[in-house]
Structures are given as structure tokens and as C-alpha cells.
Interface confidence: low
């Protein structure tokens, strides 16, 4: 009874299409494929950059898988073919790996990337990114922003750079349709009259880096003798109700009373006959329903209510 | 590990010329500026000058300026420091010292090399 | 040129003391949200060793009782606790503007 073996994939590769950390990953049939013509051959593709302790494993009939990786680092990977059981008449049969690796050979010292990278999706509506110069590098330097997602072409420049001393130090980015719940690649390189210049490469999603705007239209009611009913309006924008989270803080007499988060645009605050003097702040940020992650608004205005009956009267703003 | 390894000790007359080495392992050379710093006996210190390893570009502290020639040689990765015109106040000992530029610091030095300047 | 002020330019302190060094510069040395002030310990005989770049960064290896602090042009060094192998000559020195520039010193002794 002959063993039944099969071989690798060919031509393993790993190709960069220039979308900055998006890349692909390329083999063709494994050889003497000719006894199996009735089965359908399986793939099991497993890659990570390098220094990551766990591999992502893929299987696949296709000759082809694509997915972000971090250009900071090398990227390995192996490939070997499945023949599952019903193609042998027993045990599933697998290839030895094929591997290869990528990475783009680093210019300068690490010292010369651009330092503090700091992104900001405003409002959901604009994004703007800035850094700082790399420690030492000289005034000659400059840096250049590129990005990409998938809707793109090819990776494009920052057309709108923030300048200090004639040095670019942020970008503000033009409406980006269709661009979030999607990878975003960044690479901010440079050039030096007489340095190399370490690249920096960036992936995040925009929903994840959103800062709202602050909560308006603050206003307390009576709702009784012991109860206020604290309630503010969501901030002009794209960004829907339901998305928010707020955290509240609360001062009663110049002391601070209570802080809490909620999820909608009320809070309702036990009082006593003593307070003289009550003021509360609010702020936004995208809650767990739209977004992994998220930036805290700035504080709403004050909004404070000294001395007198609240069932009068209702404060706005 | 990161090494600077200077020349041995001089003596020179007055007027004439002296020419320090400094040779660099453990670190892409070319990656780095070279600094020289000068240091009197029980005095502070002074910076003389920084050459690029990668371009040659040099920069001199204008005092230097005119009597000390900042030279590399990529090929063995030594740097040196060539002092013309030497006169008694130049008796002092030469650092050379690595940095990448400006904020980064000098931070590896040299052994240090002393001059005497006696007729 | 800048010119780097340090003081005290001696003092006298004892193991498990905290020493505090302080430089001021002629005009301040910050660009780019970096503050371009490196300080260095010197012992007699030996080469200077980076302590602190960047005004706040550590170099690499050194203990963490050093640190630094300030921007501008009021910089501080701080030892928060002596050790035997601290008693040094310090100096700061200002790498914004050629020609880079260094403070007199402040030679710290045991007491």
C-alpha cells in the first residue's frame, strides 16, 4: 500500500501592491497534482509579523489571501496543501510548508520616525493626524504622509500638511467616503539632506479614534421635592444617538457631588433642601455599540443653578 | 557593544599640527555624527565641533573653527580631529563622542586622548 | 552663543539624600515640543556619561533614581536617593544651537 503524499504549493510569495501594510499572499498548485483531479485541493496558510507569539491560520481552496500587517516589522508565513480524507480513502495528508518572509529594509535609525503619532477622527467628520519631528533629526527634515483603504486606487499624499518653522507636522485629510469599519493605512516617511530617515507605519480604524463634540443645551427640571432631572441635547453631526456614552459630573456647593456615565441624554439627581448652588458638566464619547474604542469630548459648558426654585424654572443655556 | 577607541597620548610643540583618531565598532557608523569635545586639566568641557559619518557635512564651534579639520574615513569607521597651530592652552584632553545630532545626546564616549603642548 | 548656568556649583550631600541640580540657559532651548538639554555625570579620569537627553529622557542603562525635568530654560537634574557611586561632577549641555554648549559644572561631594 503506497504512501500517499502531496507537495507544497509553488512560487510561495508575499507581495506589497504599495497600499502600506495591506499585502498580498501568492502561491500556485503544488506539482504532480494529476492523481487528484477528482479532489479539491485545500490550503492552510498561516502568517504573523515576525516577533508576534501567535500565527492567524487561514484555509483555503483559493490561491490567493490578503490582509493588513505591520510594515514597522517583518512579516512571516507558511503554506503546506490538505488533501482531505475523502481524496485518500483515510486520514487527511498534508505537504511539508512552504515559507517566505517580507519586510522593507529599514532606513536611518529609529530615532529619525516621526515621534508621538497622534490621530483624531473630529466628530466623526475630520480626521487630522500630527507628530513630532524624530529625536535629533536636523531642520532640514521633512516628513510626508501617505494613506490608504480599500476603496482606494493606490495610497495617496496628504494634500493639506500643518506646518511649524517650515517643518510638516500633521495633515488634515479631505472627506474620506466610505472610510470607516475598515483598515486605514498610514506611512509618514522623510528625507534629509544627509540622513536616512526611519518610516513609521500606522493601521487603525477610524470609528475607533472619534472625539465628538460636546453635548449642548444643558438644562435642569424639577421632577420633586428631592429629584432633578439633569438633560442635554447630542452634539450637531453624523455621529447618532445611540452611539453616545456621557459621563456626567456633578458639584453641589462647590463640592463635587457625583460623576456617572449613561447612556442616554438624562440623569436624574437626589437633592436636599440645603443645596444653595448645583453645576454640572457633560461629555461625549462613541459607545461599545459603534466602536471599539474611543476619544472623550472636551467638557460641555456649565451649567449651574443657584438658589432657586427649580420648579419655576428651567435653565437653557 | 558600542565602542570608541582613541589614539594614545601626544606631545607637540607650539605651532605645530596633531592629528587624533577615533575608531568606532558595534554601531552602523555612518548612522551616527561624530563629536569632538575638548577638556582642560580640572576645567569644564567645550565642544570643538560634529562631522556626519554618512555625508561628511561638518559643523565647528566658530572658536575651533579655523584650526580644526573634522575628517572621516567610512572604509574603517574612524573619525579624526586634525588641530593646527597649537599653543599651551590647547594642553587638554580630546573626547571624541557618538550622537545622533541634537536631541538625541552624545552617548558613547571615547577613552579621550591627551595633548600636551610644551617646547 | 547659549550660555548654561549651573548651581550650585558644589554641594555636599550624604548617602540616601536627594540632590537637586539646576541649569539655566541664556535663551530657551525648546523646538519642535522638544527641549534639547542633555545632562552628564563625570567621574575623575573617565569620559563624561549621558544621564538624561531630551530634558526628561533617560539614557539607556542608567538608574532610575536620576531624572530630569523642566523646558525652556530652567532645567533640573534630580538624584532622589545618594548612592556612594553618585559623588561626581555634573553638567548639563544644551544641543539646540551650534555651537552645542555646556553648563560649568556642579562637582557633588560626600558629607
Known amino acids: 500500500d503506497t504512501e500517499i503524499k502531496v507537495n507544497p504549493p509553488q512560487d510561495f510569495e508575499i507581495v506589497d501592491p504599495g497600499y502600506l501594510g495591506y499585502l498580498y499572499l501568492q502561491w500556485q498548485p503544488p506539482l504532480s497534482l494529476d492523481h487528484f483531479k477528482e479532489c479539491t485541493v485545500e490550503y492552510e496558510l498561516k502568517y504573523r509579523n515576525i516577533g508576534s507569539e501567535t500565527w492567524k491560520t487561514i484555509i483555503t481552496k483559493n490561491l490567493h489571501y490578503k490582509d493588513g500587517f505591520d510594515l514597522n516589522k517583518g512579516i512571516e508565513a507558511k503554506i503546506h496543501t490538505l488533501l482531505p480524507w475523502q481524496c485518500t480513502n483515510g486520514s487527511e495528508v498534508q505537504s511539508s510548508w512552504a515559507e517566505t518572509t517580507y519586510w522593507i529594509s529599514p532606513q536611518g535609525i529609529p530615532e529619525t520616525k516621526v515621534q508621538d503619532m497622534d490621530c483624531v477622527y473630529y466628530n466623526w467628520q475630520y480626521l487630522l493626524c500630527s507628530w513630532k519631528p524624530g529625536i535629533g533629526v536636523l531642520l532640514d527634515t521633512n516628513y510626508n504622509l501617505f494613506y490608504w483603504y480599500e476603496g482606494l486606487d493606490h495610497a495617496l499624499q496628504c494634500v493639506d500638511y500643518i506646518k511649524a518653522d517650515g517643518q510638516n507636522i500633521g495633515c488634515r485629510f479631505p472627506y474620506l467616503e466610505a472610510s470607516d469599519y475598515k483598515d486605514f493605512y498610514i506611512c509618514v516617511n522623510g528625507s534629509s539632506e544627509n540622513k536616512p530617515i526611519r518610516s513609521s507605519y500606522f493601521t487603525f480604524q477610524l470609528q475607533n479614534i472619534v472625539k465628538p463634540l460636546p453635548p449642548v443645551y444643558l438644562t435642569f427640571t424639577r421632577e420633586s421635592s428631592c429629584e432633578i432631572k439633569l438633560k442635554w441635547s447630542i452634539p450637531l453631526g453624523p455621529i447618532p444617538a445611540r452611539c453616545f456614552d456621557y459621563e456626567i459630573e456633578i458639584r453641589e456647593d462647590d463640592t463635587t457631588l457625583v460623576t456617572a456615565t449613561v447612556e442616554n441624554e438624562t440623569y436624574t439627581l437626589k437633592t436636599t433642601n440645603e443645596t444653595r448652588q448645583l453645576c454640572f458638566v457633560v461629555r461625549s464619547k462613541v459607545n461599545i455599540y459603534c466602536s471599539d474604542d474611543g476619544i472623550w469630548s472636551e467638557w460641555s459648558d456649565k451649567q449651574c443653578w443657584e438658589g432657586e426654585d427649580l420648579s419655576k424654572k428651567t435653565l437653557l443655556r | 557593544q558600542v565602542q570608541l577607541v582613541q589614539s594614545g597620548a601626544e606631545v607637540v610643540k607650539p605651532g605645530a599640527s596633531v592629528k587624533l583618531s577615533c575608531k568606532a565598532s558595534g554601531y552602523t557608523f555612518t548612522n551616527y555624527w561624530m563629536n569632538w569635545v575638548k577638556q582642560r586639566p580640572g576645567q569644564g568641557l567645550e565642544w570643538i565641533g560634529r562631522i556626519d559619518a554618512y555625508a561628511g557635512e561638518t559643523h565647528y564651534n566658530q572658536k575651533f573653527k579655523d584650526r580644526a579639520i573634522l575628517t572621516v574615513d567610512k572604509s574603517t569607521s574612524t573619525a579624526y580631529m586634525e588641530l593646527r597651530s597649537l599653543r599651551s592652552e590647547d594642553t587638554a584632553v580630546y573626547y571624541c563622542a557618538r550622537g545622533y545630532g541634537d536631541a538625541y545626546g552624545m552617548d558613547h564616549w571615547g577613552q579621550g586622548t591627551l595633548v600636551t603642548v610644551s617646547s | 552663543d547659549i550660555v548654561l548656568t549651573q548651581s550650585p556649583s558644589s554641594l555636599s550631600a550624604s548617602v540616601g539624600d536627594r540632590a537637586t541640580i539646576t541649569c539655566r540657559a541664556s535663551?530657551?532651548?525648546?523646538?519642535?515640543?522638544?527641549?534639547?538639554m542633555n545632562w552628564f555625570q563625570q567621574k575623575p579620569g573617565k569620559p563624561p556619561k549621558l544621564l538624561i537627553y531630551a530634558a526628561s529622557r533617560q539614557g539607556s542603562g542608567d538608574p532610575a533614581r536620576f531624572s530630569g525635568s523642566g523646558s525652556g530654560t530652567d532645567f533640573t537634574l534630580t538624584i532622589s536617593s545618594l548612592q556612594p557611586e553618585d559623588f561626581a561632577t555634573y553638567f548639563c549641555q544644551q544641543s539646540k544651537e551650534v555651537p552645542w554648549t555646556f553648563g560649568g559644572g556642579t562637582k557633588l561631594e560626600i558629607k
Open positions: 535663551e530657551s532651548v525648546d523646538n519642535y515640543g522638544i527641549s534639547f
